[in-house]
């Protein structure tokens, strides 16, 4: 969490951002909130990016002002206009690119004063893994598959029954480059699976951690997956 305060002539206002991560090719949110004003026309929001000359986005007098917007953000940004009045200056970034990573500044001017806060934005690719019994195998084998990751993640298997066991000798992980030549498909296979056990396939890079669990019993299997973004720190 980054909390910034204004310092010049007028009073300072509190601006808060949260470090976040964008999934390349999808839409992302750069989060920023501020002390609200009672008049929309008195609020100015400017988003800037370190190393970029033009603005990322500007919103003032109740509407977007994009005359000074940098080319790399053209047609890809929007604020939540109906939420600005309640102090939401978050920016929606469409079609996140690898090059969108960096330090952003959310700069706010209201009738109460000015304030700003920085935000670290990471970009990469992350996706939910699906674990299944691999029916191409002769013995009971699990296959964990996740369609899009970047940078290359680590894959670790764990089991509820054999807690602390190292499965690296009985698993095999491969990374296959996707057609856009950036992200990769992750496939990991675990051999010698036993019944009445829950196995977890954990995929992690510096942006996200995803886990696919599968419970294997005589009657059936049950699977579930979850994904968590790392380093979501507020400023």
């Amino acid at each position: 969490l980054i909390i910034g305060f204004g310092i010049s002539g007028r009073h300072s206002i509190t601006v808060t951002t949260v470090a976040s991560a964008g999934n390349i090719g999808e839409d992302g949110i750069l989060s920023c909130t501020f002390e609200p004003d009672i008049k929309l026309s008195d609020i100015v929001i400017q988003w800037l990016k370190e190393g970029v000359l033009g603005l990322v986005h500007e919103f003032k007098e109740g509407k977007d002002e994009l005359s000074e917007q940098d080319e790399m953000f053209r047609g890809r940004t929007a604020v939540f206009a109906d939420q600005v009045i309640v102090g939401n200056a978050s920016l929606r970034l469409k079609n996140v690119q690898l090059t969108d990573a960096g330090t952003y500044k959310c700069y706010i001017i209201t009738s109460k004063g000015k304030g700003n806060a920085n935000l670290e934005y990471k970009t990469g690719a992350f996706s939910m893994p699906e674990v299944n019994v691999d029916y191409n195998a002769s013995s009971e084998t699990l296959r964990c598959e996740a369609p899009r990751w970047f940078p290359q993640p680590t894959v670790v298997w764990a089991s509820q029954v054999d807690q602390g066991a190292n499965f690296s000798e009985v698993s095999n992980t491969s990374f296959e480059l996707n057609s856009e030549n950036v992200t990769m498909k992750v496939v990991s296979v675990l051999y010698n699976v036993t019944i009445n056990n829950t196995y977890s396939c954990m995929i992690e890079n510096d942006i996200a951690k995803a886990t696919g669990d599968i419970k294997v019993t005589e009657s059936e299997i049950k699977r579930r997956s979850h994904l968590q973004l790392l380093n979501s720190k507020a400023s």
């Epitope: 699906e130 299944n132 019994v133 029916y135 191409n136 195998a137 002769s138 013995s139 009971e140 019944i195 005589e218 009657s219 059936e220 299997i221 049950k222 699977r223 579930r224």
Partner: antibody
Framework: EVQLVQSGAEVKKPGASVKVSCKAS????????IHWVRQAPGQGLEWIGE????????NYNQKFKGRATLTVDTSTSTAYLELSSLRSEDTAVYYC?????????WGQGTLVTVSS | DIQMTQSPSSLSASVGDRVTITCSAT?????MHWYQQKPGKAPKLWIY???KLAHGVPSRFSGSGSGTDFTLTISSLQPEDFATYYC?????????FGQGTKVEIK
């Protein structure tokens, strides 16, 4: 007594959506996954997907992913199947069932007819 | 997906006959379930975990098999056994059923 009671028959036009309900009673709703299975007239059984009522986690048959949506309302112990972009081949009896233990329980079935 | 093939698709038998239905899976699935369905009714779990009889199922029914090949046997067919039987696997997603075997009166 465990019971799964489904909503009544529906007639829909191609392209429309249908929402079938399955009200559970006689057991703790959040303790057992609910499965949805369909059976076209004179045909076999086809698994659509499953939902865990405790947290609404779902697994779908890839064939129905994007068209089928499974939800639950734990306050009324009711599971729902919504199927969108209906086509004539979706004409079937749709069943909800509770996950297998040593017994299983099924709803009575809901006939969905898709016809222009 | 794992495909399940039942044979025969239908059979005619007399009361007292021994009846065997087989189910073959395209991959090893370890355990199989069987359902009985009568016209206009929901299916009922009949045999689970390959060989365990569901609650209320008579002992003339039995199940066996492993890997890819499974069998449901009725040792002495009774009038109430005339129905359609489906094999079913829940050991690999998506869960799948056999196409069914209809047991009819000769």
């Amino acid at each position: 007594e465990v019971q799964l009671v489904q909503s009544g028959a529906e007639v829909k036009k191609p392209g429309a959506s249908v929402k079938v309900s399955c009200k559970a009673s006689g057991y703790t709703f959040t303790n057992f996954w609910i499965h949805w299975v369909r059976q076209a007239p004179g045909q076999g059984l086809e698994w659509i997907g499953e939902i865990d009522p405790s947290d609404s986690y779902t697994n779908y048959n890839q064939k129905f992913k994007g068209r089928a949506t499974l939800t639950v309302d734990t306050s009324t112990s009711t599971a729902y199947l919504e199927l969108s972009s209906l086509r004539s081949e979706d004409t079937a009896v749709y069943y909800c069932s509770r996950e297998i233990t040593t017994v299983d329980y099924w709803g009575q079935g809901t006939l969905v007819t898709v016809s222009s | 997906d794992i495909q399940m093939t039942q044979s025969p698709s239908s059979l005619s038998a007399s009361v007292g006959d021994r009846v065997t239905i087989t189910c073959s899976a395209t991959s090893s699935i370890s355990y199989m379930h069987w359902y009985q369905q009568k016209p206009g009714k929901a299916p009922k779990l009949w045999i689970y975990d390959t060989s365990k009889l569901a609650h209320g199922v008579p002992s003339r029914f039995s199940g066996s098999g492993s890997g890819t090949d499974f069998t449901l046997t009725i040792s002495s067919l009774q009038p109430e056994d005339f129905a359609t039987y489906y094999c079913h696997q829940r050991r690999s997603y998506p869960f799948t059923f056999g196409q069914g075997t209809k047991v009819e009166i000769k």
